[in-house]
Amino acid sequence: QLPPGKPEIFKCRSPNKETFTCWWRPGTDGGLPTNYSLTYHREGETLMHECPDYITGGPNSCHFGKQYTSMWRTYVMMVNATNQMGSSFSDELYVDVTYIVQPDPPLELTVEVKQPEDRKPYLWMKWSPPTLIDLKTGWFTLLYEIRLKPEKAAEWETHFAGQQTEFKILSLHPGQKYLVQVRCKPDHGYWSAWSPATFIQIPSDFIMNDEQKLISEEDLGGEQKLISEEDLHHHHHH
């Protein structure tokens, strides 16, 4: 029977800068029941505080609700593991809520095949930002990424969409059923999970165009921009 091993706070995430959760990995338990407690203070402060909520984030977590979250403060936190034989402490982790945002996936992904009479057909997709994110405050700039693949293909084709919430793609395989997903990330922060897949059947008479992909920006008043495969490669994110 031994004191517990050193725990590690391995991740802190916020969906929207208004709340956040941190998770730790226990060290070895020393063969005895072990209690874990997270304490923190804010930079510039010596008042030590205890985790306000060990429940919401699941096992080995501490959740900071709205009233405990301040965007303008760096949190300094540590986990203490205690059993009958002694204690051990994690390393201190410095957390700035601005840099740990991982939004929920974008919502309402709609995908349509457009076949205008005067132009080549294209795949058009549109989505909304996640509900928890308030873009009107100016606290957030969300960037988007799209991925798609034929249903039976192994590899995804990925496109960076910038701040747009609309995207157009040429060069698809006619007659194929495609899966399309979108994800987002704040300017400082982490990519969200991918949105649930939306399926779209590409008509057999869809005209292939391997040379170029067409993207349109809402922000440019409908003006269309031709982007070559080479340019797109620079925006490729995995």
Epitope: G44, T46, L47, E50, P52
Partner: antibody, heavy 118, light 107 residues
């Protein structure tokens, strides 16, 4: 309604003891850090003591260290201040005050009066 | 311990006047500073936290500013209901010291 109600104030002689209580309602008491703040008649506010949400961390103003003990019973939603070796300069209205998530006193009770006089 | 010095200790001003109260900390407290209003015979009420964040329901004529060691509370247009004693308080470390208070009266 979020509320704090103090009780236990009394007139006592120097050297005697007193225990103040504060009962909380309308909020999740065990999630909040609590404090005692006092105000001598006609004087300003003086912070007395702090206790963390589980009771594991306590702080006191120098003038009461070794004489006063702060404690809490989360099951009873109650905060206590055990006051021993009372002195005339402890005479004051004692408030219990909740510390919000960003460390500011956001909710105060109405206070309970402690008078130490021979 | 960090001392909090408020000035003036009292002031008298006319309705509609702009009133400024200052609070100095003996050491840098970043912006861990709150302002409270205590009306005669009443419980203190939080006006401002983090030096400049106005609490919900507090009239916009109240504002706070400052960082480090020097802070101010301003009432842009004094109203009869603002008769009270105002306290600054630091909250970055124990003891959670209050300033001595500023009593505001109407001329």
């Amino acid at each position: 309604e979020v509320q704090l109600v103090e009780s236990g104030g009394d007139l006592v002689q120097p050297g005697e003891s007193l225990r103040l209580s504060c009962t909380a309602s309308g909020f999740t008491f065990n999630s909040y850090e609590m404090n005692w703040v006092r105000q001598a008649p006609g004087k300003g506010l003086e912070w007395v003591s702090y206790i963390s949400s589980s009771g594991g961390t306590k702080y006191y103003v120098d003038s009461v260290k070794g004489r006063f003990t702060i404690s809490r019973d989360n099951a009873k939603k109650s905060l206590y201040l055990q006051m021993n070796s009372l002195r005339a300069d402890d005479t004051a209205l004692y408030y219990c005050a909740r510390l919000n998530g960003v460390d500011v006193f956001d909710i105060w009770g109405q206070g309970t009066m402690v008078t130490v006089s021979s | 311990d960090i001392q909090m010095t408020q000035s003036p200790s009292s002031l008298s001003a006319s309705v509609g006047d702009r009133v400024t109260i200052t609070c100095r900390a003996s050491q840098d407290i970043f912006n861990y500073l709150a302002w409270f209003q205590q009306k005669p015979g009443k419980v203190p009420e939080l006006l401002i936290s983090a030096a400049s964040t106005l609490q919900s329901g507090v009239p916009s004529r109240f504002s706070g500013s400052g960082s480090g060691t020097y802070f101010t509370l301003t009432i842009s247009s004094l109203q009869p209901e603002d008769i009270a004693t105002y306290y600054c308080q630091r909250y970055n470390s124990a003891p959670l010291t209050f300033g001595g208070g500023t009593k505001v009266e109407i001329k």
